[in-house]
């Protein structure tokens, strides 16, 4: 049914869905703090622009009686139930922030007449790509895929002179929400990644992964997995690894690698870590003081969602335009706004762009070092270390297929 929006006469409301099922196990109190901190900043920015308006957030909680798995498995119905609650209360804001689960976002987008923008901290899956009124503020799977294909094809760097066309993907079903959808995208037979590779096999059992490490008949030297170093250690332990194996560890939302006192454990020597470039320190902000480095990005995405709304509200008000229009709903894309931690760029489809960083372990210093960075906005690689101290022979990444001729 048509729900009236609390979105005019100088009063602008943000509907924040506080779902029990979330992409990250983050206490809702922390997300509330992030939203409230964002509201303070937005109010200040609007005031500085001479716009005398009120901006508030309404937090919509689900009852939690039925949908209590805590992860994203039962989020589909929870999202729709919350929308029904909004509908019954006849109270909808100018913008909807949340949900973060791919299942719920997809279903909510499908089942509603979306004449308002939806901002998500998550919704990583390919099924949430190219949605006209959806904005995603954490790197979606599509961005990861484009990096990987680009890196696989690269053969003109002094440390990577072979194009790769093969890969194993380790996916055992216990992944976090972000990892689940990242690996799901790599596994999908119709995805860009699968289309560009000649050989790809998904390893689902620990033993399969462990056997590949020393299998002379393996079909690829490259294994992609998702998680932190501890996750890899649980799986790999101190097992011997063939010298031309390369493990790509996707760990986007973890800035521990950049901390000064971090030493890379020995089991990381044949691993390249893909993570996001850390922002300026968030440690002093009230909302992030209690957050682990991994969770910081999630809370930050909520906060940036508020700042994005404030940015768009300011533009529309300054231009004398109506907020409750399809034009406003479709405007949250192809722009750069001032986020909490610096400029945030959204692509043509409303997905956040970022700088991905590929790290290696220096055999000299046992520290993580930046090998290259990748700007998802322009799909461009920026080499950083032209003479990396790799564990691999000749300080070059090996061929992806053992026994191919020299290059």
């Amino acid at each position: 049914s048509q729900v009236s929006q609390n979105c005019h006469n100088g009063s602008y409301e943000i509907s924040v869905l506080m779902m029990g099922n979330s992409a990250f196990a983050e206490p809702l109190k922390n997300l509330e703090d992030a939203v409230n901190e964002g509201l303070e900043i937005v109010r200040g920015r609007l005031q500085n622009a001479g716009l005398n308006v009120t901006v508030n957030a309404t937090f919509m909680y689900s009852d939690g009686l039925i949908h209590n798995s805590g992860d994203c498995r039962s989020s589909t119905c929870e999202g729709l139930d919350l929308l029904r609650k909004i509908s019954n209360a006849q109270r909808m804001g100018c913008v909807l922030i949340g949900p973060s689960c791919t299942y719920s976002t997809f279903q909510m987008y499908l089942d509603t007449e979306l004449s308002y923008p939806m901002i998500s901290a998550g919704s990583f899956g390919l099924s949430c790509d190219y949605k006209e009124t959806l904005t995603r503020l954490m790197s979606p799977a599509r961005k990861l895929m484009y990096f990987l294909v680009n890196f696989w094809k690269t053969n003109d760097l002094p440390f990577k002179t072979y194009s790769w066309s093969t890969s194993y993907v380790y996916k055992n079903g216990t992944e976090t929400e972000d990892c689940f959808w990242y690996l799901n995208a790599l596994e999908a037979s119709v995805s860009y990644f699968s289309h560009e590779l000649g050989f790809k096999v998904v390893l689902r059992q620990d033993k399969e992964f462990q056997d590949i490490l020393m299998d002379h008949n393996r079909k690829s030297n490259v294994i992609i997995m998702c998680g932190g170093p501890e996750f890899l250690y649980k799986l790999k332990g101190d097992r011997a690894v063939a010298e031309d194996i390369v493990i790509i560890l996707v760990d986007l939302f973890n800035d521990q690698y950049f901390e000064d006192n971090v030493t890379a454990p020995d089991y990381m020597k044949n691993v390249l870590v893909l993570t996001l470039s850390p922002g300026n320190s968030l440690l002093n902000s009230s909302f992030s003081r209690n957050l682990s480095p991994t969770k910081r990005d999630f809370a930050l995405a909520y906060l940036n969602g508020i700042l994005l709304f404030g940015h768009m509200l300011k533009i529309f008000l300054e231009n004398g335009e109506n907020i409750t229009t399809p034009k406003f709903a479709h405007a949250f894309r192809n722009l750069t706004f001032e986020g909490y931690d610096g400029p945030v760029t959204l692509d043509d489809w409303g997905d956040v762009d970022s700088t991905m960083v590929l790290l290696y372990t220096s055999v000299d210093t046992k520290k993580y070092k930046v090998l290259l960075t990748y700007d998802t906005h322009v799909n461009k690689t920026y080499p950083v270390d032209m003479s990396p101290t790799f564990t691999w022979k000749n300080s070059k990444l090996p061929n992806d297929i053992t026994g191919r001729g020299p290059q």
Partner: antibody
Framework: EFQLQQSGPELVKPGASVKISCKAS????????MNWVKQSNGKSLEWIGV????????SNNQKFKGKATLTVDQSSSTAYMQLNSLTAEDSAVYYC???????????WGQGTTLTVSS | QIVLTQSPAIMSASPGEKVTISCSAN?????IYWYQQKPGSSPKPWIY???NLASGVPARFSGSGSGTSYSLTISSMEAEDAATYYC?????????FGGGTKLEIK
């Protein structure tokens, strides 16, 4: 417009040190590696080293280890190369050159002429 | 390190003549890059990744090759093409340049 503006010619005595500068403009300085290249009189080009302005990562040609020290100043978008213990062999034109991967050395400074003579 | 040998070291060509400059590597490389330098000027990128012309380079230039053997070709020599041409590799660290080919106009 992209530009790499190098410091002027230097005449120095043997045993001394010199610091050559290369000021970048027209692009994001921290995004691109900066290379240094030596060209002795009428001779070919010799690569000295490269520095990444964002992370400070340096890769040197072994031949110039101990001879050349590369640094950057992000605030002024300037790269520097210090050459020490100078001898007549170090007399040459020195160029800074930006990388724009996959096009290596895509923009060059105008060159700095160094003359080492007593 | 990889050694690049250019031949000839010096050559002259008449206007309209086809010119080929060779660059030979002592070890296989994936790509070669070419630079043009005129007296008193900095080198200019001319051809990158073996066969891609840099911005502003006339279409009479082309590059080709693979493995250890590469070449730069001018289909029809013009006076403004007189310069020294250097090949360069970044397949292995450190990057190295060839000794240069000085091309003169007859």
């Amino acid at each position: 417009e992209f530009q790499l503006q190098q410091s002027g010619p230097e005449l120095v005595k043997p045993g001394a040190s010199v610091k050559i500068s290369c000021k970048a403009s027209g692009y994001s300085f921290t995004d691109h590696n900066m290379n240094w290249v030596k060209q002795s009189n009428g001779k070919s080009l010799e690569w000295i080293g490269v520095i990444n302005p964002k992370y400070g990562t340096i890769s040197n040609n072994q031949k110039f280890k101990g001879k050349a020290t590369l640094t950057v100043d992000q605030s002024s978008s300037t790269a520097y190369m210090q050459l020490n213990s100078l001898t007549a062999e170090d007399s040459a034109v020195y160029y800074c050159a930006r990388d724009d991967y996959p096009n290596y050395f895509d923009y060059w400074g105008q060159g700095t002429t160094l003359t080492v003579s007593s | 390190q990889i050694v690049l040998t250019q031949s000839p070291a010096i050559m002259s060509a008449s206007p309209g003549e086809k010119v080929t400059i060779s660059c030979s590597a002592n070890s296989s490389v994936n790509y070669i890059y070419w630079y043009q330098q005129k007296p008193g000027s900095s080198p200019k990128p001319w051809i990158y990744r073996t066969s891609n012309l840099a911005s502003g380079v006339p279409a009479r230039f082309s590059g080709s090759g693979s493995g250890t053997s590469y070449s730069l070709t001018i289909s029809s020599m013009e006076a403004e093409d007189a310069a020294t041409y250097y090949c360069q590799q970044y397949h292995s660290f450190p990057p190295t340049f060839g000794g240069g080919t000085k091309l003169e106009i007859k």
